[in-house]
């Protein structure tokens, strides 16, 4: 139970980070114009990964497009690009899990094809989430050097007779939002991740250690193994999986190919 | 027709109080941001205040600050300037004007005078 | 605040004739966002309030003659009239609607001969 509600949730929670970093990646407010300290202007600018608007105190709002490709700052380019991959993998690995989902039966897909789409989908939700976190800081990153280059020549003017007010920006939501998205994405993912040990079937043999008593013997064997009466064929110590007996916290309790995660 | 009729103007006591109101019709009154506007006897604009679309945003000139207050009533398609601590320096004729593209000020009033005077 | 300067203050025509009138604002009304200058003129008639001519510095309002021209960037704005009618006779002012207070011009008027 523990697994499924582990990868369940991870699901979900991956499921909402990449809804936010889609969210963010499209949103217009990645900076905005900084009021602070600045006079008060009867217009508010705002830039966005794709467009940059303009809303007047009218209400009217005017946005523009970039119809440049090259003419783009490289950094501006970077952070599209970290933000669609995000986006991308983020979008196979919920395609991924979904299948994964102990919940889900399809066919007779084995746990261990689960377990293994368990992982890949963690995996991409994890480097998705840090797509976004890492495209998002960037961006800000850009913000904040930006900000103290134009506070340093915040008025500039033909011999201090005419001014010309810089446009600073400042934080936009969108970076809270691809923040927080991004950072459940990879909640998300890691979640994922814990989950595939749970569902990882059993591959190590333990060696049985047989008591024999006179007349009746019980080979004793530990979880992964059925106990058996006599001197049958089970006394040759194979595994037996048992996939609906055990509890999810034994599963997790044995070593399996999945641990180096 | 886009209309904006202005009522509540008169001769005041200086330190006195005033309200004006401003009865638009012929477009969505709700949907636009308004303006006051005076102008004084030397026939000199001065833009006196601005209220949002939902009233909880307003912008002031400094002179009349503390003593002005601009408000609306979206549902009765009005929209009011209340004026306390009334100056001989107020005295001007009262235009409200609906703000358009460019915070323009594409319609105006027939203005209202208000008088400060002892 | 922001202060307008209007030049000359008044300006003595005849019809037919072309005129340009001047605004000087004391800081840029240039927005760096959309590279709008946000400066209107207005004409307004003895006895009547005013009317919108021009938005963003050079965009005619609808039903304006298209000899009323607005033009500039920056700080330096001009009107130009470019064939003046007797029905043009009247004060012509520009207001900043960039930064707040909105302030106004003290006008040109334009009288004819």
């Known amino acids: 139970m523990a697994v499924t509600a582990c990868q369940g949730l991870g699901f979900v929670v991956s499921l909402i980070g990449i809804a936010g970093i889609i969210a963010a990646t499209c949103m217009d407010q990645w900076s905005t114009q900084d009021l602070y300290n600045n006079p008060v202007t009867a217009v508010f600018n705002y830039q966005g990964l794709w467009r940059s608007c303009v809303r007047e105190s009218s209400g009217f709002t005017e946005c523009r497009g970039y119809f440049t490709l090259l003419g783009l700052p490289a950094m501006l380019q970077a952070v599209r690009a970290l933000m669609i991959v995000g986006i991308v993998l983020g979008a196979i690995g919920l395609l991924v899990s979904i299948f994964a989902l102990k919940c889900i039966r399809i066919g007779s897909m084995e746990d261990s094809a689960k377990a293994n789409m368990t992982l890949t989908s963690g995996i991409m939700f994890i480097v998705s989430g840090l797509c976004a976190i890492a495209g998002v800081s960037v961006f800000a990153n850009m913000l904040v050097t930006n900000f103290w280059m134009s506070t340093a020549n915040m008025y500039t003017g033909m011999g201090g007779m005419v001014q010309t007010v810089q446009t600073r920006y400042t934080f936009g939501a969108a970076l809270f939002v691809g923040w927080v998205a991004g950072g459940l994405t990879l909640i998300g993912g890691v979640m994922m991740c814990i989950a595939c040990r749970g569902l990882a079937p059993e591959e190590t043999n333990y060696k049985a250690v047989s008591y024999h008593a006179s007349g009746h013997s019980v080979a004793y064997k530990p979880g992964g193994f059925k106990a058996s009466t006599g001197f049958g064929s089970n006394t040759k110590n194979k595994k037996i999986y048992d996939g609906g007996a055990r509890t999810e916290d034994e599963v997790q309790s044995y070593p399996s190919k999945h641990d180096y995660v | 027709e886009i209309q904006l009729v202005e009522s509540g103007g008169g001769l005041v006591r200086p330190g006195g109080s005033l309200k004006l109101s401003c009865a638009a019709s012929?477009?969505?009154?709700?949907?636009?941001?308004m303006s006051w506007v005076r102008q004084s006897p030397e026939r000199r604009l001065e833009w006196v205040a601005e209220i949002r679309t939902g009233g909880d945003y307003t912008y002031y000139v400094d002179t009349v600050t503390g003593r002005f207050t601009i408000s609306r009533d979206n549902a009765k398609n009005t929209l009011y300037l209340e004026m306390t601590s009334l100056r001989s320096e107020d005295t001007a004729t009262y235009y409200c004007?609906?703000?358009?593209?460019?915070?323009?000020?594409?319609?105006w009033g027939q203005g209202t005078t208000l008088t400060v005077s002892s | 605040d922001i202060v307008m300067t209007q030049s000359p203050s008044s300006l003595t025509v005849t019809a037919g004739e072309k005129v340009t009138m001047s605004c000087k604002s004391s800081q840029s009304l240039l927005n760096s966002g959309n590279q709008k200058n946000y400066l209107t003129w207005y004409q307004q008639k003895p006895g009547q309030p005013p009317k919108l001519l021009i938005y963003?510095?050079?965009t005619r309002e609808s039903g304006v003659p298209d000899r009323f021209t607005g033009s500039g960037s920056g700080t330096d704005f001009t009107l130009t009239i470019s064939s003046v009618q007797a029905e043009d006779l009247a004060v012509y002012s520009c207001?900043?609607?960039?930064?707040?207070?909105?302030?106004f011009g003290a006008g040109t008027e334009l009288e004819l001969k």
């Open positions: 963003w510095a050079s």
């Open positions: 207001q900043n609607n960039y930064f707040y207070p909105l302030t």
């Open positions: 004007a609906r703000v358009g593209y460019g915070n323009s000020l594409d319609y």
């Open positions: 012929g477009f969505s009154f709700k949907n636009y941001v």
